[in-house]
Interface confidence: low
């Protein structure tokens, strides 16, 4: 005896209640081999992990791990996370143009330096990819008497904690 | 030789999780779907959930909020957790495998498990 | 889920008896239905598959037969190696779900 399920194809289930008919996967639910009676849930891309193919009739989502992000607009593949002096953008990483720094690994944007002048201060250690500068005391805190500056830490985006 | 055998701890205190482990050998855990199976001892058969070659599950309604099937492919291992035992879960535990054609055409020799504490 | 039903709950019969084991589904389940075989060892194998099918290496004196809701396993002719219990599993749908078995004995 052939089993009638046998022909329902990938995309399908063999639908018990009504006498066999292939019928179409539910949404959010696939079958990738034919004859099956019942169609698989797709996998949702939680916690840590994104979505890097949606789920389609015939296949189940791809995840991408914790350390990778989705590349394009259907996730079509996993990219390694950006690292400090890179920023994410709609092509991947991409480099801090000069002038701009990203201290954070994984997250954030590409930030301009600090602009030490506008605060009067002298620039003490130049700006990196992945550093701002470091401003140096303003000409009035050299004066006779006055005590040690300890540089300003570099700025950072609100709600992000320190690496 | 397709062969599949459970490996479990025996006996497991009441309220704990349980933990067996099904090895695979002669057959791809890719291409075969993989049952466990149950039997209370003097009773019948029980199906407990089964895990397709794609990785999900589906699993007893009345047991689902305690159980747990994974798989690692590369181990060809298939494990089941059930968790808050009573000594209801008292059986035998077997894993079997699940063909295209949807019966189990090989078992494990199956692994007892005692709850008492 | 659905429910199965095996009648007798054990049998005892003579060797060279035909013996009959009955499965009933508590609703239509088309001819997705399996009987196994689990001998006193624990050891359980596949005998019919698809109603009627017989597996591979299973002696041709077991047959099955039925549809929708009543199924039967069939020895033609008991031999001392079928003491064993008998069980009939569908697989119309999730979850899957066995009968109570049949506890076969030779008198």
């Known amino acids: 005896l052939q089993d009638p399920c046998s022909n329902c194809p990938a995309g399908t289930f063999c639908d018990n209640n009504r006498n066999q008919i292939c019928s179409p996967c539910p949404p959010n639910s696939f079958s990738s081999a034919g004859g099956q009676r019942t169609c698989d849930i797709c996998r949702q891309c939680k916690g840590v992990f994104r979505t890097r193919k949606e789920c389609s009739s015939t296949s189940n989502a791809e995840c991408c791990i914790e350390g990778f992000h989705c590349l394009g607009p259907q996730c079509t593949r996993c990219e390694k996370d950006c690292r400090p002096g890179q920023e994410l953008t709609k092509q991947g990483c991409k480099t801090c143009s000069l002038g701009t720094f990203n201290d954070q690994n994984g997250t954030g944007v590409c930030r301009p330096w600090t602009n030490c002048s506008l605060d009067g201060k002298s620039v003490l250690v130049n700006g990196t990819k992945e550093r701002d500068v470091v401003c140096g005391p303003s000409p009035a805190d050299l004066s006779p008497g006055a005590s040690s500056v300890t540089p300003p830490a570099p700025a950072r985006e609100p709600g992000h904690s320190p690496q | 030789q397709v062969q599949l055998q459970e490996s479990g701890p025996g006996l497991v205190k009441p309220s704990e999780t349980l933990s067996i482990t099904c090895t695979v050998s002669?057959?791809?855990?890719?291409?075969?779907?993989v049952h466990w199976v149950r039997q209370p001892p003097g009773k019948g058969l029980e199906g407990l959930g089964v895990i397709w070659p794609g990785g999900s599950t589906n699993y007893n309604s009345a047991l689902m909020s305690r159980l747990t099937i994974s798989k690692d492919n590369s181990k060809s291992q298939v494990s089941l957790k059930m968790s808050s035992l009573t000594a209801a879960d008292t059986a035998m535990y077997y894993c079997a495998r699940v063909t295209g054609t949807w019966y189990f055409d090989v078992w494990g020799q199956g692994t007892t498990v005692t709850v008492s504490s | 889920d659905i429910q199965m039903t095996q009648s007798p709950s054990s049998l005892s019969a003579s060797l060279g008896d035909r013996v009959t084991i009955s499965c009933s589904a508590s609703?239509?389940?088309?001819?997705?239905l399996n009987w196994y075989q689990q001998k006193p060892d624990g050891t359980v194998k596949l005998l019919i598959y698809?109603?009627?099918t017989l597996h591979s290496g299973v002696p041709s004196r077991f047959s099955g037969s039925g549809s929708g809701t009543d199924f039967t396993l069939t020895i033609s002719s008991l031999q001392p190696e079928d003491v064993a219990t008998y069980y009939c599993?569908?697989?119309?749908?999730?979850?899957?779900?066995f009968g109570g078995g049949t506890k076969l004995e030779i008198k």
């Open positions: 599993q569908q697989y119309s749908k999730l979850p899957w779900t």
């Open positions: 609703q239509g389940i088309s001819n997705y």
């Open positions: 002669g057959s791809s855990l890719t291409s075969y779907g």
């Open positions: 698809y109603t009627s």
